[in-house]
Interface confidence: low
């Protein structure tokens, strides 16, 4: 039994760290392996995580952790029975992957705009609550070439979108992900998509027919 790609771990910096690794052959992760983890601090308890299979040779462990502070370092040991396969350390504050933003909704707003809203996945008392910036991806469900990416660098989890920037009568989907710049985090996973019909009509369509120009 041998580790092909050693464990790499990310923390949501509030309650959970997730480690993933790849074995050199298909492995029943939960039956054959255990990941032990312990906060590198006097008197800290040793915990054991039972991994699950993500693919036939890729294992994933989700570890409950206390509300992390920057200096926290965990000692990790990967075991196959009595055999130590890998040993390493993990500092959650250096490997942050934010939680996924939630409850993405789209609302018609004044002046032919759509208001996209979502929820910050962190409570206000958490360090990351005020650190998140977002990326919103808006795509035409029937035209893969028609997509837009918006970086939301201000605090509020909202985006105003002019309906005129989207094709009239087309169905669009949006999804959002988060990033914590000061922690040099990775991006969160994408939120589930929300879909809506862009029923805005360009103003030219209301002109008398002989004034209506087609642009090619």
């Amino acid at each position: 039994v041998k580790v092909l790609h050693e464990p790499s771990c990310f923390s949501d910096y509030i309650s959970t760290s997730v480690c993933q690794w790849k074995m050199d052959h298909p492995t029943n992760c939960s039956a054959e392996l255990r990941l032990s983890y312990q906060l590198d601090f006097m008197g800290s308890e040793n915990h054991t995580c039972v991994p699950e299979n993500r693919e036939d040779s890729v294992c994933v462990c989700s570890m409950p952790i206390d509300d992390a502070v920057e200096a926290d370092v965990y000692q990790l040991d990967l075991w196959a029975g009595q055999q130590l396969l890998w040993s390493g350390s993990f500092q959650p504050s250096k490997h942050v992957k934010p939680r996924t933003p939630g409850n993405l909704t789209v609302h018609p707003n004044i002046s032919h705009t759509w208001l996209l809203m979502w929820t910050n996945p962190y409570p206000t008392e958490n360090h990351l609550h005020s650190e998140l910036t977002y990326m919103v991806n808006v795509s035409n469900d029937n035209d893969p070439e028609d997509f837009k990416v918006y970086n939301v660098t201000y605090m509020g989890p909202t985006l105003r979108l002019a309906a005129s920037t989207l094709k009239s009568g087309a169905s669009y989907s949006a999804r959002v992900r988060a990033w914590a710049q000061t922690y040099n985090s990775t991006w969160s996973d994408w939120s589930p998509s929300t879909t809506w019909l862009n029923y805005y009509e360009p103003w030219e369509q209301h002109l008398p027919h002989h004034h209506h120009h087609h642009h090619h």
Epitope: K2, L4, H5, E6, P7, S8, Q20, W21, K22, V58
Partner: antibody
Framework: QVHLKESGPGLVAPSQSLSITCTVS????????VSWVRQPPGEGLEWLGV???????YFHSALISRLSISKDDSKSQVFLKLNSLQTDDTATYYC?????????????????WGQGTSVTVSS | DIVMSQSPSSLTVSVGEKVTMSCKSS????????????LAWYQQKPGQSPKLLIY???TRESGVPDRFTGSGSGTDFTLTISSVRAEDLAVYYC?????????FGGGTKLEIK
């Protein structure tokens, strides 16, 4: 200074076995893996197999039945043995060190290579 | 086994020109655990052993001139030489180390006009 050097017989008769030794310096075989790669004349590179610091081995799927790789850590030597040679085993055989640990993850690229030893399979 | 395909098989350029060569993998080489692509590029000059140029698809090996750049992710990768020099005459190979058995592409032979 990392150095690898292959030594082989040069000429081997068909159906016989090929044995090549790779002698290394500048790193420990208990810490790093060594791969074997061959190159038929005028052709590309073909990975044959690897032996890791803990002694575990992995082989090219087409050669698994007739290839073995072993080592002597104390002598800093890695050994390749290929059985039942055919003419299409004619090639230059290289040993190469598997790369160092970088940025917290394993780098399995081959960062140092020997100069190669030419092997001809012919009667 | 993961199949690596390189194109073109050969190309001829003048000194100072920019060169790009392609490497495609039959399987994804991006490992989700660390967001790294397990792909290397090697240079083999005539009569010499291969030399490591790039690993992790885009990280230059120490001592390799910065005119060599690796890019790409997943299954499509590119090696670019920004301004070819006469000493770059060689065959360039890509290699995946995502899974066993490690496999090489067939090589791209760079010739100088």
């Amino acid at each position: 200074q990392v150095h690898l050097k292959e030594s082989g017989p040069g000429l081997v008769a068909p159906s016989q076995s090929l044995s090549i030794t790779c002698t290394v310096s500048g790193f420990s075989l208990t810490s790093y893996g060594v791969s074997w790669v061959r190159q038929p004349p005028g052709e590309g590179l073909e990975w044959l197999g690897v032996i890791w610091g803990d002694g575990s081995t992995y082989f090219h799927s087409a050669l698994i039945s007739r290839l073995s790789i072993s080592k002597d850590d104390s002598k800093s030597q890695v050994f390749l043995k290929l059985n039942s040679l055919q003419t299409d085993d004619t090639a230059t055989y290289y040993c190469a060190k598997q790369g160092t640990i970088y940025d917290g993850y394993y780098n399995y690229a081959m960062d140092y290579w020997g100069q190669g030893t030419s092997v001809t399979v012919s009667s | 086994d993961i199949v690596m395909s390189q194109s073109p098989s050969s190309l001829t350029v003048s000194v100072g020109e920019k060169v790009t060569m392609s490497c495609k993998s039959s399987q994804n080489l991006l490992y989700g655990g660390n967001q790294k692509n397990y792909l290397a590029w090697y240079q083999q000059k005539p009569g010499q052993s291969p030399k490591l140029l790039i690993y992790w698809a885009s990280t230059r090996e120490s001592g390799v001139p910065d005119r060599f750049t690796g890019s790409g992710s997943g299954t499509d990768f590119t090696l670019t030489i920004s301004s070819v020099r006469a000493e770059d005459l060689a065959v360039y190979y890509c290699q995946q180390y995502y899974d066993y058995p490690y496999t090489f592409g067939g090589g791209t032979k760079l010739e100088i006009k």
